[in-house]
């Protein structure tokens, strides 16, 4: 009796998820009579994939008609492949019996499943950070196979280098996930900036997937404050202006204080946007000089985006204003707190206690 050979010609087969996989197997002889079974894995824990003789295997079909005379082709086709189908498949010949007796196994065919990564999801910090600070963005993509994958970060088209990336799990798996964190330095010009997480994988045929996040969701650009006085009006009223410039987001509350007492509170709304995405706002306060015997200390107090208030004070010297009509003498500006461009500075009223 000639020695039966079970031939699995392919050592490995790679299939895209959703496609069908054909696993080839032929036997060298019609002898002995008995069925072919397909298993995934070897040993006692192997999983039955197809049994020509009996069972219901809805995703598996025989490539050749098993009833065909002289049939020695026992290849199978598995439909709608998912990453969970990855593994080594063995074509095993049995000798007819009660029960059938395992006779010989093929060498096995390793099925690897090429699964596309999910669309990258980029998430930024939970709370806004002030310009000139560094924030972290994370990018996640799941369900891909094989494990090899490339992830790059870009900010406004420029690749970022302060990046940490992990692919899990480290060992063999049916599919993998990638998680990457990029640290991004925010600048005052970043309101319209965007970070992009770009994922390249063999399944994507050179057309990488991208996830984006707008820095406008993550950034806070604190305002510049400037308090100025217009010329004395004929009715002895001084028009004092508080210019709040280059801030983002728009959420801002401005309070005028006269000698420490609240005079008026305003909320910014429907402001026009600057080219760089920031906002400007100007508030005016009319001070009736003739109603005051002493100098008037005016404070423009700005609370931006829930941060501690920033103050800018200005003293109107009543003594410097002749009461006659038409005087152009300017009140003296005794404000000493010019704010810097990067962070809140303590002002002369010491209202600001926190730095971010």
């Amino acid at each position: 009796e000639e020695e039966l050979q079970v031939i699995q010609p392919e050592k490995s087969v790679s299939v895209a998820a959703g496609d069908s996989a054909t696993l080839n197997c032929t036997v060298s002889s019609l002898i002995p009579v008995g069925p072919i079974q397909w298993f995934r894995g070897a040993g006692p824990g192997r999983e039955l994939i197809y049994n020509l003789k009996e069972g219901h295997f809805p995703r598996v079909t025989a490539v050749s008609d098993p009833t065909k005379r002289n049939n020695m082709d026992f290849s199978i086709r598995i439909s709608n492949i998912t990453p969970a189908d990855a593994g080594t498949y063995y074509c095993v010949k049995f000798r007819k019996g009660s029960p059938d007796v395992e006779l010989k196994s093929g060498a096995g065919t390793e099925l690897s499943v090429r699964a596309k990564p999910s669309a990258p999801v980029v998430s930024g910090p939970a709370v806004r950070a002030t310009a000139e600070h560094t924030v972290s963005f994370t990018c996640e993509s799941h369900g891909f196979s094989p494990r090899d994958i490339t992830l790059k970060w870009f900010k406004n088209g420029n690749e970022l280098s302060d990046v940490q990336t992990n692919v899990d799990p480290a060992g063999k798996s049916v599919s993998y996930s990638i998680r990457s964190t990029a640290r991004v330095l925010l600048t005052r010009r970043d309101v319209h900036s965007q970070v992009i997480c770009e994922v390249a994988h063999v399944t994507l045929q050179g057309d990488p997937l991208r996830g984006t996040a707008n820095l406008s969701e993550a950034i806070r650009v604190p305002p510049f404050l400037e308090v100025t006085q217009q010329s004395m009006r004929a009715d002895n009223q001084v028009n004092v202006t508080c210019q709040v410039t280059k801030f983002y987001p728009q959420r801002l509350q401005l309070t005028w204080l006269e000698n420490g007492n609240v005079s008026r509170t305003e909320m910014a709304s429907a402001l026009p946007e600057n080219k760089d995405g920031t906002y400007n706002w100007t508030s005016w306060l009319l001070v009736n000089v003739s109603a005051h015997r002493d100098d008037v200390k005016l404070t423009c107090q700005v609370e931006h985006d829930g941060q501690p208030a920033v103050n800018k004070s200005f003293s109107v010297k009543v003594s410097a204003h002749p009461k006659e009509q038409g005087s152009n003498t300017a009140a003296e500006n005794t404000g000493t707190n010019e704010r810097g461009s990067s962070d809140y500075k303590d002002d002369d009223d010491k209202h600001h206690h926190h730095h971010h």
Partner: antibody, heavy 119, light 110 residues
């Protein structure tokens, strides 16, 4: 375990028809040929025909091709053999048999159905 | 059509002795490297049982005292040492074309 269970004995008059059933279990019915063989009393085996349940392909012995019809019902894994225009020499035990190796052989057999044709 | 002729029609052999049954085909039954001959045993009141397939291969569970041989047109079933339970009618069958049976050989104990 492969089992082929046949219908009970029949007595028919000449000229009538008979339909014998064979219910299969213990294997995937559509993956193997079913043969029909008869044996007249004290005589040898005579092959009638075979059917592939997956697509109803049939092969008939020329002697029977005008009188015998094989069918299957895959929903119940049952094969049928109908023989028409019965004569007294059709009296025989009719066997169904499953071809396990697709070798056009008969590996597993039913117990047989005795059909008696008598006026 | 291929015609199979068995010889002898009947045979009586002593227990423990060798029994030999022949089957001759009217034309060669060899095809695709195989001899398409099968041997069956039928005991009274029972359906036939497959003994040998493709001329020389014992079916599962068949005692090794049964063997088949031959090629082309001439084939032999041999029982090396007859046992009482081997009393039966033996049939050859070919399937190079569609199945046909030989007329049968009745084996008895001498």
């Amino acid at each position: 375990q492969v089992q082929l269970v046949q219908s009970g004995a029949e007595v028919k008059k000449p000229g009538a028809s008979v339909k014998v059933s064979c219910k299969a279990s213990g294997y995937t019915f559509t993956n193997y040929w079913i043969n029909w063989v008869r044996q007249a009393p004290g005589q040898g085996l005579e092959w009638i025909a075979m059917i592939d349940p997956s697509d109803s392909e049939t092969h008939y012995n020329q002697i029977f091709k005008d009188r015998a019809t094989l069918t299957t019902d895959t929903s119940t894994s049952t094969a049928y053999m109908e023989l028409r225009s019965l004569r007294s020499d059709d009296t025989a035990v009719y066997y169904c048999a499953m071809d396990y190796g697709s070798l056009y052989a008969m590996d597993y057999w039913g117990r047989g159905t005795l059909v008696t044709v008598s006026s | 059509d291929i015609v199979l002729t068995q010889s002898p029609d009947s045979l009586a052999v002593s227990l423990g002795e060798r029994a030999t049954i022949n089957c001759r085909a009217s034309q060669s039954v060899r095809s695709s490297g195989y001899n398409w001959i099968f041997w069956y045993q039928q005991k009274p009141g029972q359906p036939p049982k497959l003994l040998i397939y493709l001329a020389s291969n014992r079916d599962s569970g068949v005692p090794d005292r049964f063997s088949g041989s031959g090629s082309g047109t001439d084939f032999t079933l041999t029982i090396s040492s007859l046992q009482a339970e081997d009393v039966a009618v033996y049939y050859c069958q070919e399937s190079r074309e569609l199945p046909t049976f030989g007329q049968g050989t009745k084996l008895e104990i001498k």
